[in-house]
C-alpha cells in the first residue's frame, strides 16, 4: 500500500477519505486505527456502527468521527480540532471476521495555523456560544508519498 498524506491546519477539522471497492467489501464494517511505530500494531481509534446497515451514521470517539458510504465505497474520517499530537501514520481498515484489511495508509500532517499569533500575545478563544468548528472551513490537502519517502523518521 502506498501512503497518502493528508495535511490539516492546527485547530481546524481535517477530513480523510478512503475509497474502496464497495462490491468486495460488501457487508464489512470499517475502522480507523493509528500505527504505533513502523512495525508496531495499529491501535483502533474508532469503528463504524456495529450494524453494517447503519454504517452511514457518524460515530465519534473523542474528536475523531467515522462514517461509511457503503454503496459509493468511501470511508470518511473527520479529525476535529486538529492538534500537533494528531500527526502520524494511520490506516483505514475493512473488518473481516478477526482480520482487518488495509484500505489505505494515511500520513496525517499538522500545519501551524497561520492566523495563530500566540507569539504576539493576542490569543483568541471562541466564546461559549461560538462553535470553533464553524469558524473554519473543513480543509485537507492530500498527496501520495514519493518513492523513497518514509512516513516515520529513522530512529537513532
Amino acid at each position: 500500500h502506498n501512503t497518502t498524506v493528508f495535511q490539516g491546519v492546527a485547530g481546524q477539522s481535517l477530513q480523510v477519505s478512503c475509497p474502496y471497492d464497495s462490491m468486495k467489501h460488501w457487508g464489512r464494517r470499517k475502522a480507523w486505527c493509528r500505527q504505533l511505530g513502523e512495525k508496531g500494531p495499529c491501535q483502533r481509534v474508532v469503528s463504524t456502527h456495529n450494524l453494517w446497515l447503519l454504517s452511514f451514521l457518524r460515530r465519534w470517539n473523542g474528536s475523531t468521527a467515522i462514517t461509511d458510504d457503503t454503496l459509493g465505497g468511501t470511508l470518511t474520517i473527520t479529525l476535529r480540532n486538529l492538534q500537533p499530537h494528531d500527526a502520524g501514520l494511520y490506516q483505514c481498515q475493512s473488518l473481516h471476521g478477526s482480520e482487518a484489511d488495509t484500505l489505505r495508509k494515511v500520513l496525517v500532517e499538522v500545519l501551524a495555523d497561520p492566523l495563530d499569533h500566540r507569539d504576539a500575545g493576542d490569543l483568541w478563544f471562541p466564546g461559549e456560544s461560538e462553535s470553533f468548528e464553524d469558524a473554519h472551513v473543513e480543509h485537507s490537502i492530500s498527496r501520495s508519498l514519493l518513492e523513497g519517502e518514509i512516513p516515520f523518521p529513522p530512529t537513532s
Epitope: 462490491m23 460488501w26 453494517w52 454503496l71
Partner: antibody
C-alpha cells in the same frame, strides 16, 4: 452473456472430500462480482455455501466454514469448491452462481450438478 | 445468522389469480432482499433484486415490495408457466434463503 458450468465427480465416499469446479464463459472472473456456491439437498431448500472474489478473498457459511475451501484460478477463468469430511447429509445438487449483491443479485447460475455421498 | 421466514410454504391458485407470498427477516435488512423462481429440475432464476427491482427479461406481472423486516412478492395474474417454488434471500450478511413457497395451479 456470462454462463456458468459446474463439473466434478457425482459420487463421493463418506469422510472423503467433495471437489467441484465452475467454469465461467462469456465474461471474466475478474469482473466486479462474488462467485458463489449454493446447494440444495433432495426435496429441500437452498443453502449458501460460500463465495470468492477475483482476488481470492472469501466468505463462508459459518455452519460449513470448518470444512469448506473455495479457490479461484484466473488463468482458467474458473473457481472451485472443496468440502471435506462429507457425510450423507452433504448429498445435494450443487450450483455455482454469480452474485452482484446490491447491483443485481445472484443473476447467473450454472445448471447444477448432483453429488451423492455414499459408499 | 439472519433467518428468513417465508409463508405460506405452499399455495394453490387458479390461472389469472393474484398470488402473494410474504417473507420476514429476523432483523432489519433494509431493501437487501432478492426473490428467485425455481422450476423442478432447474436452477433458480432471479426475478426481483433489491426488494422491488425487476430483473432483466422478467415479465411485469411479477413484483416485489417491502423494506426493513417485512417483504411481499406478488404475481398479479398467475400463468401456467409460473408453477414453481419461489424463494426470498437476504444478502446483508452471509446470504440466507427463505424456506420456499411452492405454487400450484388449482
Amino acid at each position: 452473456q456470462v454462463q456458468l458450468q459446474e463439473s466434478g465427480p457425482g459420487l463421493v465416499k463418506p469422510s472423503g472430500t467433495l471437489s467441484l469446479t465452475c467454469a465461467v464463459s462469456g465474461g471474466s472472473i475478474s469482473d466486479s462480482a462474488w462467485w458463489s456456491w449454493v446447494r440444495q439437498p433432495p426435496g429441500k431448500g437452498l443453502e449458501w455455501i460460500g463465495e470468492i472474489y477475483h482476488d481470492a478473498d472469501t466468505n463462508y457459511n459459518p455452519s460449513l466454514k470448518s470444512r469448506v475451501t473455495i479457490s479461484v484460478d484466473k488463468s482458467k477463468n474458473q473457481f472451485s469448491l472443496k468440502l471435506s469430511s462429507v457425510t450423507a447429509a452433504d448429498t445435494a445438487v450443487y450450483y455455482c452462481a454469480r452474485d452482484t449483491k446490491y447491483w443485481g443479485g445472484m443473476d447467473v447460475w450454472g445448471q447444477g450438478t448432483t453429488v451423492t455421498v455414499s459408499s | 445468522d439472519i433467518q428468513m421466514t417465508q409463508s405460506p410454504s405452499s399455495l394453490s391458485a387458479s390461472v389469472g389469480d393474484r398470488v402473494t407470498i410474504t417473507c420476514q427477516a429476523s432483523q432489519d435488512i433494509s431493501n437487501y432482499l432478492n426473490w428467485y423462481q425455481q422450476k423442478p429440475g432447474k436452477a433458480p432464476k432471479l426475478l426481483i433484486y433489491d426488494a422491488s427491482n425487476l430483473a432483466t427479461g422478467v415479465p411485469s406481472r411479477f413484483s416485489g415490495s417491502g423494506s426493513g423486516t417485512d417483504f411481499t412478492f406478488t404475481i398479479s395474474s398467475l400463468q401456467p408457466e409460473d408453477i414453481a417454488t419461489y424463494y426470498c434471500q437476504q444478502y446483508v450478511e452471509a446470504p440466507t434463503f427463505g424456506g420456499g413457497t411452492k405454487v400450484e395451479i388449482k
